[in-house]
Interface confidence: low
Amino acid sequence: GSGVFQLQLQEFINERGVLASGRPCEPGCRTFFRVCLKHFQAVVSPGPCTFGTVSTPVLGTNSFAVRDDSSGGGRNPLQLPFNFTWPGTFSLIIEAWHAPGDDLRPEALPPDALISKIAIQGSLAVGQNWLLDEQTSTLTRLRYSYRVICSDNYYGDNCSRLCKKRNDHFGHYVCQPDGNLSCLPGWTGEYCQQPICLSGCHEQNGYCSKPAECLCRPGWQGRLCNECIPHNGCRHGTCSTPWQCTCDEGWGGLFCDQDLNYCTHHSPCKNGATCSNSGQRSYTCTCRPGYTGVDCELELSECDSNPCRNGGSCKDQEDGYHCLCPPGYYGLHCEHSTLSCADSPCFNGGSCRERNQGANYACECPPNFTGSNCEKKVD
């Protein structure tokens, strides 16, 4: 049942040992009790004991104290279990009867075997506290106490809330005095079925099947499932949502594995040359004077370009080159002549003409000869 009405008989006094009719019991009043619990009636009347009935064996003769039976067997206090919401009101009839023999059934007793009958009614809230009462008639006195308590797993003001503590797949909770659930540590939700994940575990990207756990949903990683997993094979990129591959600066391609900044990452140009990116994995080196090659790795000999004129010979130097001019010539490239037409500088029949700017003369060569002095034969 949802609750139990408990009646504790404490003392019955019948000093003269008489029945309700006034007739004495022979040899004494062997007293037992019948209890009837029913719904509230303004005037308690006969009829079915709608909340239950209970009777006792013979408890004593005439006047006696009733021993408390704390074994819980339902003997004293008497137990009247009920299986409904306690209404908060009741009627109670307690009859004391004389048992001339061993048969205590109503039909086996003479009608005048009644010693006394009390009837009370009123309000009674569920609670642990006993209500003490004493009812006195001209001949008898009965002292007793009563209360209503909830059965195991029933709670609330009317014992109407069923709550059974549990710690399994269907819930992890204990019951509060009002019947509400109180979740065990690490659990939440209406029936405490939902585990509380590791503190900080991402609400959307993480989940858990037991407290303090953080399991990641597909595409997420990290202790708190707040780091996305980039596209498989992403080399130089990151993600803001799973399976993305957003390239770092200087990288391109689907997997961010194509170098767009070869100059910075590899410094391919040598000897102080200037590097320019010109596409994926391509670059151009602009060499300083004196250097050549794709990466300006080759040092040039400046004499290779035959800078010395008029038969001057070229010599490489650390900072460039030097022309050794033949007699009659001078200048950086032996371009200036100290000769004039009077010195007959033109060979092979070349004709000499005086000049004013730069050189002092110029040779006009016959066919098949060239050079500033017609000194070279053209094959």
Epitope: G47, G74, L104
Partner: antibody, heavy 118, light 107 residues
Amino acid sequence: EVQLVESGGGLVQPGGSLRLSCAASGFTFTDNWISWVRQAPGKGLEWVGLINPQSGSSDYADSVKGRFTISADTSKNTAYLQMNSLRAEDTAVYYCARDNFGGYFDYWGQGTLVTVSS
Amino acid sequence: DIQMTQSPSSLSASVGDRVTITCRASQDVSTAVAWYQQKPGKAPKLLIYSASFLYSGVPSRFSGSGSGTDFTLTISSLQPEDFATYYCQQSYTGQSTFGQGTKVEIK
């Protein structure tokens, strides 16, 4: 003299319905509860359910809950057992009994046989 | 539901024997136990109520005892008319339950 007389038993097909009656006499019908108890052939006694004729409140064994309904007509001093969705395992002799002060059965009817078979 | 377990399920005895039948409840039922006698083709008859009280008209050779979970029906001197099946019943809860019965046969 206290008397309880059942009627209404018979053969019914599985899934069918039947209503049993229990006519009471010789005592105040509204001051007692009436219980129905059944006994399958060669088996023991099984409490089926009860009714408080005065209030109409009733209770049932788990095995029949939702299928059987107990009612009472106080003007006729008669209790009824309405049996629906009958099964082969409901085959039994059905007794009504007076459920006296303390919950024991001091008077019984003679019983009526219900056979559920196709 | 409270289960009532009776033992033995059957026994053979002779007229004049003392016979004891026991009934064990699956939980405490105070003294809310009754005993019944049933003969073939007949309705059960009440023998004992409230564990130990003899019902009106029942011979005094029948007696009952016990409280809590263990109960006993004793027939002090078996008579020919006592050969029958005996059932215990608990009425501690609204959902009354019976034991499975003990058949007392002639030896």
